[in-house]
Interface confidence: medium
């Protein structure tokens, strides 16, 4: 069942992402969940992917995030790799070409990912029951 495979992959990636703090997980992103009423599930996934893409495009080479130690550098590279994987899977789940994201409320990346994990876990429990 395609839904399960994609969702499992997303949840697995989110678990990895939320396990470890890096220099840049406290940077802020647009909180698309703050005003998600009247928004379809596909739109939510599409907007989440857009926000993540904006984040890693902007911060992939950010010197603050890359850090000054080998460990910090490795953790940031890992973060970006996971975000790209998550972005790809969310686009697949959304099935939309693009979606608008209004620069409104802000959330830290780590809170954004935790919220997304909750939504995905809820979806998975419905999907598998």
């Amino acid at each position: 069942h395609k839904c399960d495979i994609t969702l499992q992959e997303i949840i697995k990636t989110l678990n990895s992402l939320t396990e470890q703090k890096t220099l840049c997980t406290e940077l802020t992103v647009t909180d698309i969940f703050a005003a998600s009423k009247n928004t379809t599930e596909k739109e939510t996934f599409c907007r989440a992917a857009t926000v993540l893409r904006q984040f890693y495009s902007h911060h992939e080479k950010d010197t603050r995030c890359l850090g000054a130690t080998a460990q910090q550098f490795h953790r940031h590279k890992q973060l970006i790799r996971f975000l790209k994987r998550l972005d790809r899977n969310l686009w697949g789940l959304a099935g939309l070409n693009s979606c608008p994201v209004k620069e409104a409320n802000q959330s830290t990346l780590e809170n954004f990912l935790e919220r997304l994990k909750t939504i995905m876990r809820e979806k998975y429990s419905k999907c598998s029951s």
Partner: nanobody
């Protein structure tokens, strides 16, 4: 409204020390990573240091490593930058910063001049 107010800049001799402070308001300071950047005349903005909310993880540019120390007091909503062994090349306007989405929110800056 987010406000970042830097203080502590001034004129200092080479080898001297300064401590910069940044008073933050308008957001939950303890939840966010904060940092210092600087801009010397005719040069691009350079990240100097960054610190996560708990203070356990820090970043320093190679040019200041071992001389500058970033710290924060979450109970006072204040960010600090202790600058020791200052050099002429440290002369710049120092900005306190908070990341805001794809943009960074800056204070007005405080001028640090290292000269004999």
């Amino acid at each position: 409204e987010v406000q970042l107010l830097e203080s502590g800049g001034g004129l200092v001799q080479p080898g001297g020390s300064l401590r910069l402070s940044c008073a933050a308001s308008g957001f939950t300071f303890r939840n966010f990573g904060m940092g210092w950047a600087r801009q010397a005349p005719g040069k691009p903005l350079e990240w100097v240091s960054w610190i996560i909310s708990s203070g356990t993880e820090t970043y320093y540019a190679d040019s200041v490593k071992g001389r500058f120390t970033i710290s924060r007091d979450n109970s006072k909503n204040t960010l600090y930058l202790q600058m020791n062994s200052l050099r002429a090349e440290d002369t710049a306007v120092y900005y306190c910063a908070k990341s805001l989405g794809r943009f960074d929110y800056w204070g007005q800056g405080t001028l640090v001049t290292v000269s004999s």
